[in-house]
Interface confidence: low
């Protein structure tokens, strides 16, 4: 003869794949203190238990090592711990208490466990700013993972130079020493739960601060096509009276501050233009000589110079001789 008792709490519980859940169970208060027996958790419809404290009883292979009976008759505890939840754990379960010396056992009401797709994703935290050439520790964490589950496997993917730091059950540290070319590239942390065969990932775009590496001048002369200067140039022939537009361009993150100077400027020199554009509407003797574009950045500056050589128009000189 079986005696029934009601499981306390909800009739169903939800757990995400790969995570853990505790199915609460309290032994009936009517249970005699002298009652000695074994506890068994069953999946509805199956006669092999999923968990038990009976050393002579085999449990289902599917649940072995993942389902545990938390047995403490003094505290009336008969809860079921499920770790590394799998989709196929989606079922109804009940608890049975039986004794070899008693005529009757106790059987609980049923409780449904719903296993849902894993929606949590890893968090990637970056302390402060990523600076080119400086190591930074990035942490990929899964704070929603339970300690008693099979430790997840952390995988990092990045084009930047990296090395693995310490890890815990819930986090992994990656030391990254980014280069300028790593700015805006992807870094992925992937977390695999081997117990459930589930993988989640998060991808971030690296924001790498770096000083300008390249500075260039594009020259627009009248209506003719622009051309670009990538290194200091000794002289650029320009026709007197011609309009000239000099466009300075530099990389760097955050963007470098561009300014134009006449001549080779001292550090505290006053710029003739506070942008990357220098307009020379009519080139004359005042414009002959050097023009320098400086790309200023908190992490370092770079400059490029251009020397203008004015070709005088013959008629422009006739009256002055």
């Amino acid at each position: 003869q079986e005696r029934r008792f009601q499981l306390e709490g909800p009739e169903s519980l939800t757990v995400q794949e790969g995570l853990c859940v505790l199915v609460p169970c309290r032994l009936p208060t009517t249970l005699p203190a002298s009652y000695y027996g074994y506890g068994y958790w069953f999946l509805e419809g199956a006669d092999v238990p999923v968990a038990t404290n009976d050393p002579d009883e085999e449990v289902q292979e599917e649940t072995r090592g993942r389902f545990h009976l938390l047995w403490d008759p003094r505290r009336k505890n008969c809860s079921l711990s499920i770790r590394d939840a799998r989709r196929r754990d989606n079922a109804a379960y009940f608890f049975r208490l039986k004794s070899k010396w008693m005529k009757y056992g106790y059987t609980s009401s049923k409780l449904s466990v719903r296993v849902m797709a894993l929606t949590h994703r890893p968090n990637i935290s970056i302390p402060g700013t990523l600076e080119s050439g400086h190591p930074s520790n990035l942490t990929c964490s899964v704070p929603w993972v339970c300690e008693q589950g099979t430790p997840p496997i952390f995988s990092w993917m990045s084009a930047a130079p990296t090395s693995l730091g310490p890890r815990t059950t819930q986090s992994s540290v990656l030391t990254i020493t980014p280069r300028p070319q790593d700015h805006s590239t992807n870094l992925t942390c992937q977390v695999t739960f081997p117990g459930a065969g589930v993988t989640m990932e998060r991808t971030i775009q690296l924001n790498v601060s770096y000083a300008p590496q390249k500075v260039a001048i594009s020259i627009f002369q009248g209506n003719s096509a622009a051309f670009k200067i990538l290194q200091n140039t000794s002289s650029l022939p320009v026709l007197e009276g011609q309009a000239l537009r000099l466009l300075c361009d530099a990389d760097g993150n955050p963007p470098a501050h561009l300014s134009w100077f006449q001549g080779f400027p001292a550090l505290n020199a006053t710029p003739i233009s506070n942008t990357g554009v220098l307009e020379l509407p009519q080139v004359g003797s005042a414009e002959e000589g050097d023009f320098t574009c400086r790309a200023q950045h908190p992490l370092g500056s770079l400059q490029i110079s251009l020397s203008l050589f004015v070709h005088w128009k013959p008629e422009g000189r006739a009256g002055g001789v």
């Epitope: 799998r86 989709r87 196929r88 430790p151 496997i153 952390f154 995988s155 990092w156 993917m157 693995l164 992925t188 992937q190 695999t192 081997p194 459930a196 065969g197 993988t199 990932e201 991808t203």
Partner: antibody, heavy 121, light 106 residues
């Protein structure tokens, strides 16, 4: 060029063991699982298990767990599979493969050259 | 574990013909991968995540389906397509493969 290089063939006696190797090149070895797949002559493909090169954590196909032991040597970017107590049923081509990680899908994007294991006395 | 059944086992087609092969899962899966294998060679990824062609796969190949079944279609078969095609799932652990469809060109 991403490659998984495996020895061409192994001839072993029944009851013996064999250790197959899979050398990776052309990518960051520690960023990808190595999987092993079995193909018996004229038959389909069967997943044996996987190993992650950073932790060495393994996950096996329960059906073949007794037969295979997966290990890894990070320093040489090589994965190994030891097959024990070999019988004629284990005569097959064994492939190692790399898994591509998509946001919502997995597939084997790189396969090894395959090692033909022949169990014969 | 999920069982994948492929049909037909052998498919014979003439160049230029349209062919479709099917992969049926014993329970619903969220996506399907396909691999091509030629005799004496390793399998090659062919279609991943149901409908995405792997690198270098001609546009005459396409994949479709959801839940179950899934299919691989070749709009106009060419001689170089002669091979065995395997479907594979990993919606449920462990990953499983179909038994293969062998495509023969007449």
């Amino acid at each position: 060029q991403v490659q998984l290089q495996q020895p061409g063939a192994e001839l072993v006696k029944p009851g013996a063991s064999v250790k197959l190797s899979c050398k990776a090149s052309g990518y960051t070895f520690t960023n990808y699982y190595i999987h092993w797949v079995k193909q018996r002559p004229g038959q389909g493909l069967e997943w044996i298990g996987m190993i992650h090169p950073i932790s060495g954590s393994t996950n096996y196909n329960e059906k073949l767990k007794i037969k295979a032991t997966l290990t890894v040597d990070k320093s040489s970017s090589t994965a190994y599979m030891q097959l024990s107590s070999l019988t004629s049923e284990d005569s097959a081509v064994y492939y190692c493969a790399r898994r591509y990680y998509g946001s919502s899908y997995w597939y084997f994007d790189v396969w090894g050259t395959g090692t033909t294991v022949t169990v014969s006395s | 574990q999920i069982v994948l059944s492929q049909s037909p086992a052998i498919l014979s087609a003439s160049p230029g013909e349209k062919v479709t092969m099917t992969c049926r899962a014993s329970s619903s899966v969220s996506y399907m991968n396909w691999y091509q294998q030629k005799p004496g060679s390793s399998p090659k990824p062919w279609i991943y995540a149901t409908s995405n062609l792997a690198s270098g796969v001609p546009a005459r190949f396409s994949g479709s389906g959801s839940g179950t079944p899934y299919s691989l279609t070749i709009s106009r078969v060419e001689a170089e397509d002669a091979a065995t095609y395997y479907c594979q799932q990993w919606s449920s652990h462990p990953p499983t493969f179909g038994s293969g469809t062998k495509l023969e060109i007449k």
